[in-house]
């Protein structure tokens, strides 16, 4: 029998400086593109090698982005969220939610589409 999988949820403010090729990550989610069941939030789906986010090291695939420069990302269409990041300026402040898997018992499987990445 599988052990129960619990999650430790933490929030962090991450300040990124836009690099020559931008912020360096991909997102999924939005009201028209639910990546996680019953959650229209915006999630990080890819960190680009040597990009600003990768060099900073704190943002991780699977993180939920709650706000950009203080602007809430709730109830946004996917493309509107993309545009918000693209127009966020040189210094970008992200409020993110990390969801760390805490294993109780045997190792579980984390599949694609799970917000923990």
């Amino acid at each position: 029998m599988n052990g129960r999988v619990d999650y430790l949820v933490t929030e962090e403010e991450i300040n990124l400086t836009r690099g020559p090729s931008g912020l360096g990550f991909n997102i999924v989610g939005g009201t028209d593109q639910q990546y996680v069941s019953n959650d229209s939030g915006i999630y990080v789906s890819r960190i680009k090698e040597n990009g600003a986010a990768a060099l900073d090291g704190r943002l991780q695939e699977g993180d939920k982005i709650l706000s950009v420069n203080g602007q809430d990302l709730k109830n946004l269409l996917h493309q509107d969220a993309v545009d918000l990041f693209r127009n966020a300026g040189y210094a970008v402040s992200l409020r993110v939610q990390h969801r760390l898997q805490v294993q109780n018992g045997p190792i579980g499987h984390r599949g694609e589409g799970d917000p923990s990445g």
């Epitope: 990550f25 999924v28 789906s45 890819r46 493309q79 990041f85 694609e112």
Partner: nanobody, 126 residues
Framework: QVQLVESGGGLVQAGGSLRLSCTAS????????MAWFRQAPGKEREFVAA??????YYADSVKGRFTISRDNAKNTMYLQMNSLKPEDTAVYIC?????????????????????WGQGTQVTVSS
């Protein structure tokens, strides 16, 4: 890990048509940004077309002749190729990445994509 499998290639006469398919694994297919590239013998890999959440992109050499589309219910992307020319002869390869870049999107840049198929051969005879 996303697996991509292309099909639909073959031998066709100039002026003819083919429809290529790229079927992907994964249950979040609708979020993928996807593209077609091609590589002819002795040449660099060349961008053909891409499809994102918000639109489609084409190389100038195929505009008006090729159409990229997707069927999210079938986890499949398509490339409808009409008015084929001998210079369209190449191995056609599909590429994908999960999500949309928050940066300026460069559809022709291979670094935009994480996953690549093996390709399907298209030969156009004159």
């Amino acid at each position: 890990q996303v697996q991509l499998v292309e099909s639909g290639g073959g031998l066709v006469q100039a002026g003819g048509s083919l429809r290529l398919s790229c079927t992907a694994s994964g249950r979040t297919f609708s979020t993928y940004t996807m593209a077609w590239f091609r590589q002819a013998p002795g040449k660099e890999r060349e961008f053909v077309a891409a499809i994102t959440w918000s639109g489609t992109y084409y190389a100038d050499s195929v505009k008006g002749r090729f159409t990229i589309s997707r069927d999210n219910a079938k986890n499949t992307m398509y490339l409808q190729m009409n008015s084929l020319k001998p210079e369209d002869t190449a191995v056609y390869i599909c590429a994908a990445v999960i999500g949309s870049t928050v940066d300026s999107y460069s559809p022709s840049d291979p670094l935009e994509y994480d996953y690549w198929g093996q390709g399907t051969q298209v030969t156009v005879s004159s």
